[in-house]
Interface confidence: low
């Protein structure tokens, strides 16, 4: 799904930091200002504006040191591996003054039998092996250290954990003569946490386990286990929280049922059912106890596992998630959509909204998209006037220093943000739609008309007259 969305309102780029002074010569000592803003309350917006201004004015003083890159560290414990037996690892960018740690789990579907794992190894080796991983990665979105791009947690220690286990971060089986592939997703997370304790995580105040897509589901499956691990290792004071992006899937009825042949057409329940056996998958203990043996697959679905979790979790989910539609065998090609499909899509949004009803910390825009938090322009989308970084900040505030979310929402600082309008892109801040196959940008109005929506209904929230909308449709403007 990389590069499939246009995020910033076009033509608008963040202003570059002012460069009014020369940067220090290489090797010249530079003072560091370790700052941590975990405890700041009150007028956060005004405070953040001042901090941004300070950060940008200090930029020329440390241009040499302002390296956005996260550096690769392969696990020292080489028995914890990717699918092909190569060592797993993580990318790290430390922020020594901060006691916040962000651990991000990458996404990228899964494979659940020898045949489709072989195919994945041929076509997407990076997701099964560390052999060709680059030495550095750039932190983007919530992993960015630039306050302009990441007004939420720019000062945190950033960790990107590449996905190379193909098991939705749930596996606990090593490569052997019997097993062609290792599936060690759950163990990789545990081992990364263990190694990071020696790199400063031991002094953390907050550990935010985040992830997108399969990584988002991975958060739901692992967040409580990480909290337990830290407790057992003697770090009960570290607050563990979860941020699950685009990993809250429904085990709904497919639009068109297909046999379970490959990853994408296999109904999610069946794929996970097979996967758990193949991966020796583990699920959160409290969830597992709610289901009979052989029914652990239920715990991969957000609305079933969430009520059993102890750690606070913030759920980010597009109401019309492209991956959800894909597994439901909905392929929007720009061809006119039958009434039945339109109703199916609308119903999907309605069902998803319903599953988030009792999730106090959630952000669900009515858009057709997939993943958001490590997109550079993750700040652009809003639900009812609130952006995701703002909602996350409000969530931080609502948690205070306790592990439990406070029941009373902070005035003017909402954390439950779920769009109520009923069709894709009725939210004016949605990212641009692209045709799934051609990659061409699609005009929203055109897209909605193809989906069979009534002109007046569609035109109004776009701030248009039906006649204008008709004109737009005829040329895709």
């Amino acid at each position: 799904s990389e590069g499939r969305k246009t995020w910033r309102r076009r033509g608008q780029q963040p202003p570059p930091p002012p460069r009014t002074e020369a940067a220090p010569a290489a090797g010249q000592p530079v003072e560091s200002f370790p700052l941590d803003f975990t405890a700041v309350e009150g007028n956060m917006d005004s405070f953040m504006a001042q901090v941004k201004s300070l950060a940008q004015s200090l930029y020329p003083c440390s241009a040499q040191q302002l390296n956005e890159d996260l550096r690769l560290h392969l696990l020292l414990n080489t028995s914890v591996t990717c699918n092909d037996g190569s060592p797993a690892g993580y990318y790290l960018k430390e922020s020594r003054g901060s006691r916040r740690w962000l651990l991000f789990l990458e996404g990228g579907w899964y494979c659940f039998n020898r045949e489709n794992c072989d195919s994945r190894y041929d076509t997407m080796r990076r997701l099964m092996s560390s052999r060709d991983w680059p030495r550095t990665r750039t932190g983007t979105g919530i992993l960015s250290s630039q306050p302009e791009e990441n007004p939420y947690w720019w000062n945190a220690n950033m960790v990107f954990i590449p996905y190379c286990s193909s098991d939705v971060w749930s596996g606990a089986s090593s490569k052997s003569e019997k097993n062609e592939y290792a599936f060690m997703g759950a163990l990789i997370i545990q081992e990364v946490v263990r190694e990071l304790l020696g790199r400063g995580l031991s002094g953390a105040k907050v550990l935010l386990l985040a992830g997108s897509s399969a990584g988002g589901t991975g958060v739901l499956l692992n967040v409580d286990r990480v909290a337990e691990q830290l407790e057992k290792l003697g770090y009960p004071a570290i607050q563990v929280r979860g941020l699950a992006d685009s990993g809250w899937f429904l085990d709904n009825k497919q639009y068109r049922h297909t046999d379970c042949v490959d990853t994408i057409t296999c109904a999610p329940t069946e794929a996970i059912r097979r996967g758990i056996r193949y991966w020796n998958g583990v699920v959160p203990e409290r969830c597992r106890r709610q289901f009979q043996e052989g029914e652990e697959w239920n715990c991969f679905f957000g609305y079933k596992v969430y009520p059993t979790l102890r750690c606070p979790v913030f759920v980010v989910q597009w109401l019309f998630d492209e991956a959800q539609l894909t597994v439901d065998n909905v392929h929007l090609t720009g061809q006119p959509v039958q009434e039945g499909l339109r109703l199916y899509i609308q119903n999907l949004g309605r069902e998803l909204r319903h599953t988030l009803k009792d999730v106090p910390a959630s952000f669900a825009p009515a858009c057709l998209s997939h993943e958001i938090i490590i997109r550079s322009h993750w700040t652009d989308v809003q639900v009812k006037g609130t952006s995701l970084p703002r909602a996350l900040h409000c969530w931080d505030r609502s948690l205070h220093d306790s592990h439990k979310a406070s029941k009373t929402p902070l005035k003017g600082c909402p954390v439950h943000l779920v769009d109520s309008c009923p069709w894709p892109h009725c939210n004016p801040s949605c990212p641009t739609v692209r045709d799934q196959f051609t990659g061409q940008e699609m005009n929203v109005a055109q897209f909605l008309m193809h989906m069979g929506f009534d002109m007046q209904t569609v035109a109004q929230p776009q701030g248009l007259e039906p006649s204008e909308l008709l004109g737009m449709l005829s040329n895709g403007s």
């Epitope: 809003q382 109004q460 737009m472």
Partner: antibody, heavy 119, light 111 residues
């Protein structure tokens, strides 16, 4: 740099005609709906006309319908406003502005060109 | 057409204090949780500059001293703390349907 620059403003007699132009740069002009707006001396802002990105939708303020014609050339990145049967009340600074995708606000404005209608 | 009534027509505020400008629409400019009201600042001899879009969103590069709120028919622009350079004219604009219309403007003076 995203920029809009108007030209063509002049002193013209009542009943006369004038063509204003707006040159765009720094963004993909063909992706955006464009507007003309105006401001009479010491007065507020008034919307004049709108053209969708592909020129299929044209819309005008009631007092300008039939007298003004909005057009665009995406290849040349230019927006035009042909004004005929001009009246003294058309005296104003004319601005071209870009309509933002997500909600119909004007996120980029030109510097304006002055049209004076007087005998 | 939707008529926007802006008030007050002029406003005098002390340096460092809060300036509040109101804009009332003749019919609702909100739909499905979104409010199609925007605010601009116009300095003499210059074109208007977008400050706030969709009622409460700060345009990139605009200081956080500016904020917008409201929904339905009643909207507010707040400036706090007011600075010398804020002394100029402010307009609200809706884009709920064509034609877009503007308020008559509020002239802010700093004392």
């Amino acid at each position: 740099e995203v920029q809009l620059v108007e030209s063509g403003g002049d002193l013209v007699k009542p009943g006369g005609s004038l063509k204003l132009s707006c040159a765009a740069s720094g963004f993909t002009f063909s992706d955006y709906g464009m507007h003309w707006l105006r401001q009479a001396p010491e007065k507020g802002l008034e919307w004049v006309a709108y053209i969708s990105s592909g020129s299929t939708t044209l819309s005008y303020a009631n007092t300008m319908k039939g007298r003004f014609t909005i057009s665009r050339d995406n290849a040349k990145k230019t927006l035009s406003l042909q004004m005929t049967s001009l009246r003294s009340e058309d005296t104003a600074i004319y601005y071209c502005a870009r309509k933002n995708y997500n909600g119909g606000y004007f996120d980029v404005w030109g510097t304006g060109t002055t049209v004076t209608v007087s005998s | 057409d939707i008529v926007l009534t802006q008030s007050p027509a002029s406003l005098v505020v002390s340096l460092g204090q809060r300036a509040t400008i109101s804009c009332r629409a003749s019919k609702s400019v909100s739909e499905s949780g979104y409010s199609y009201m925007h605010w601009y600042q116009q300095k003499p001899g210059q074109p208007p500059k977008l400050l706030i879009y969709l009622a409460s969103n700060l345009e990139s590069g605009v200081p956080a001293r500016f904020s917008g709120s409201g929904s339905g028919t009643d909207f507010t622009l707040n400036i706090h703390p007011v600075e010398e350079g804020d002394a100029t004219t402010y307009y609200c604009q809706h884009s709920r349907v064509l034609p877009p219309t503007f308020g008559s403007g509020t002239k802010l003076e700093i004392k």
